[in-house]
Interface confidence: low
């Protein structure tokens, strides 16, 4: 039976490195002469770089290296034929047998990765990220798909703001240069990166990185048509309401980041809920086409929002939006009104009175405090009714006379705000005068439904 023994030895091992032990079995008494074995190497294949790379201890069967030059990248495996002879190896009287020792030379990281070119080239459109810019290729003589072969790439220069990164393709070992932060063509039109390649494990002792372990990557940035942008955005202006149509409010212009493209920007209106504005398509001048009204339902918290579009004529055309916020300062353009519009009171002045309040769509100081008054004409109004101001917003309307016949009366009330100049309004309060119980509640609703309309008398 021919035995095969397997062993390993790292490449580059020094002479005297232990490799493996082979042993033969003899049925004779190992202490008798015919059981004492001796070992020798009969042959070594291949015989490079020396025919005697290994030696065997003739008594123990220990195989050790005796020559330098083990190089996995040249010889990956040695096959030794080992002879064992009894009778202390006496070739005349001893019996012999042979076995095979297969010694595999294992890889160490004695070969650095080397770039296949001094310079690699790539290009990237501005503002794009997560795209592959360039493929870096290296060669490494160490065993593929091991830490001694797997390449690790790093950028050692030319990228101070960290716009690029390099990932390793696990199959090909290529370096994939990707963009991780957007690049602005107007700021950087080209990058020259210095890149280095190393392995996942350090190089073996005494091995240096050659110049081929570094390379340059020349990345050209491609100019892309970018969106024009308004600045500031939103633009806030303060303006009194009530401006007449045709008033120039402001100029709202956009900048185009594309300094190296000859382009024009045109302006259009996107949103103008009340249709108060127009924008000059060429110079961005915003002009009123209607009266601005702070009290419009389109104005929220005194602010009117309009949005505009700036479009360039690039290929493809790009656009950006901007919001104009007009903070409308109140003017006294609304006369106050009286609430409620209808009320109820008793035929006699006691026990109740009518509470009235002011409503003004303007805000301070163009609203309250309010003045309440009754008109001089018709004379019956002031004769029959009296109005008393409780505070800036409230007043009370009471019967002045001891009795007024049940019916429905229209009482005009003059209300004036505190604006400068003030605004006045005559509000008509429809007062239902009725017979009341002791609690001041109407008791004759049915009778009054058909009652005629009076003018306060």
């Amino acid at each position: 039976l021919h035995q095969v023994w397997n062993g390993t030895v790292p490449e580059g091992s020094k002479p005297g490195t232990y490799v493996m032990t082979v042993t033969a079995i003899d049925a004779d008494d190992p202490n008798a002469l015919n059981g004492m074995l001796r070992y020798r190497i009969v042959s070594q294949a291949p015989s490079t770089p020396s025919p005697n790379m290994f030696t065997i201890n003739n008594e123990t069967g220990d195989i050790i290296t005796v020559a330098a030059g083990l190089d996995r990248e040249k010889v990956q495996q040695y096959t030794l034929i080992i002879q064992a002879t009894d009778m202390e190896g006496n070739p005349t009287y001893g019996l012999s047998n042979t076995a095979t020792a297969v010694i595999t030379v294992t890889d160490v990281n004695d070969n650095p990765p080397e770039f296949t070119a001094m310079t690699f080239y790539g290009e990237v459109p501005e503002n794009r990220v997560d795209i592959i810019v360039a493929n870096l290729t290296v060669t490494d003589k160490d065993q593929p798909h091991t830490p001694a072969w797997n390449a690790v790439y790093r950028i050692s220069g030319g990228d101070p703001t960290g716009r690029f990164a390099i990932q390793t393709d696990p199959n090909s070992n290529d370096g994939l240069v990707t963009v991780v932060k957007p690049i602005d063509f107007e700021t950087n039109r080209m990058f020259v990166l210095t890149v280095a390649a190393e392995n996942q494990v350090p190089l073996a002792k005494g091995i240096q990185h050659p110049p081929q372990s570094t390379a340059t990557v020349s990345v050209t940035v491609i100019d892309v048509n970018e969106n024009p942008y308004f600045a500031p955005n939103p633009k806030i202006i303060r303006q009194e309401e009530g401006l007449h149509a045709g008033t120039m409010l402001t100029t709202f212009t956009a900048q185009d980041p594309d300094r190296y493209m000859q382009q024009n920007i045109r302006y259009t209106k996107l949103s103008d809920p009340a249709n108060w504005l127009k924008i000059d398509p060429v110079n961005g001048q915003i002009t009123t086409i209607a009266v601005l009204d702070r009290e419009s339902p389109n104005v929220k918290n005194n602010i009117y929002n309009a949005t505009f579009l700036a479009s360039d004529n690039g290929i493809p055309p790009m656009s950006g939006t901007g919001t104009l916020q007009i903070y409308l300062l109140d003017i006294n353009d609304n006369a106050p009104q009286v609430l409620p519009q209808e009320a109820e009171t008793c035929e006699t002045p006691d026990p109740n009175s009518i509470n009235i309040t002011a409503l003004d769509y303007d805000i301070d100081p163009n609203a309250g405090p309010f003045a309440f008054d009754l008109p001089l004409s018709p004379v019956t109004i002031k004769r029959n009714w009296t109005i008393t101001r409780l505070n800036g917003d409230f007043a009370q309307l009471n019967l002045k006379i001891k009795f007024l016949e049940a019916g429905i009366y229209e009482v005009p009330i003059i209300i004036t705000d505190s604006g400068n100049p003030p605004k006045s309004n005559i509000s008509i309060l429809r007062v239902k005068v009725c017979q009341c119980d002791s609690n001041g509640d109407c008791t004759d609703v049915d009778r009054i439904v058909g009652a005629g309309l009076g003018t306060g008398a």
Partner: antibody, heavy 119, light 107 residues
Framework: QVQLQQSGAELVKPGASVKLSCKAS????????IQWVKQRSGQGLEWIGW????????KYNEKFKDKATLTADKSSNTVYMEISRLTSEDSAVYFC????????????WGQGTTLTVSS | QIVLTQSPAIMSASLGERVTMTCTAS???????LHWYQQKPGSSPKLWIF???NLASGVPDRFSGSGSGTSYSLTINSMEAEDAATYYC????????FGAGTKLELK
């Protein structure tokens, strides 16, 4: 930046009057209402009234209309509040504040003036 | 005039606890005109929340405000030591009034 600087603490005898000031800076004085608020020790806030430098309009809380008088000096961007016929009930911290652009909130406040009425 | 009633008058909360205080108006108030202020002893009040739910500049986002009509509230979703203060609600819808305040203490 917007600031409302109030005059220093006052110790006044009962029956006398006192005039507190509130100097505005960092914004257009005539665009905003200046409010006055009273706070007695350990108590809540009580609105006294407002002054509108743009037109000279004034509005008082009914409770204070015979107690406080609001005036202003546009040249120095200062609003004044005179409190008359002082009693111990008037001892309090008085704040001036600016009414914001919308909703009526008070967006900036003075540091307050402490008024002590004591004989 | 509109009366604002704040409840509770005094409350205490542990660090990390959720806190809610309420402000009830005697008649309906537009949400645009209901505001909250924070005041610490010896300091001026500070605008804290305006128009019911908008946080003033510099106010941490653990604060929020909500409500409509006559019922409004201020909530702190996780109490911190610096939140101990008195909080006042304020309306400018009809005339101008403040609530009596809710004093929030650290437990």
């Amino acid at each position: 930046q917007v600031q409302l600087q109030q005059s220093g603490a006052e110790l006044v005898k009962p029956g006398a009057s006192v005039k507190l000031s509130c100097k505005a800076s960092g914004f257009t004085f005539t665009d905003y209402l200046i409010q006055w608020v009273k706070q007695r020790s350990g108590q809540g806030l009580e609105w006294i009234g407002w002054f509108y430098p743009g037109s000279g309009s004034i509005k008082y809380n009914e409770k204070f209309k015979d107690k406080a008088t609001l005036t202003a000096d546009k040249s120095s961007n200062t609003v004044y509040m005179e409190i008359s016929r002082l009693t111990s009930e008037d001892s309090a911290v008085y704040f001036c504040a600016r009414r914001g652009d919308w909703g009526g909130f008070f967006d900036y406040w003075g540091q307050g003036t402490t008024l002590t009425v004591s004989s | 005039q509109i009366v604002l009633t704040q409840s509770p008058a005094i409350m205490s909360a542990s660090l990390g606890e959720r806190v809610t205080m309420t402000c009830t108006a005697s008649s309906s108030v537009s949400s645009s005109y209901l505001h909250w202020y924070q005041q610490k002893p010896g300091s001026s009040p500070k605008l804290w929340i305006f128009s019911t739910s908008n946080l003033a500049s510099g106010v941490p986002d653990r604060f929020s405000g909500s409500g409509s009509g006559t019922s409004y509230s201020l909530t702190i979703n996780s109490m911190e030591a610096e939140d101990a203060a008195t909080y006042y609600c304020h309306q400018y819808h009809r005339s101008l009034t403040f609530g009596a305040g809710t004093k929030l203490e650290l437990k």
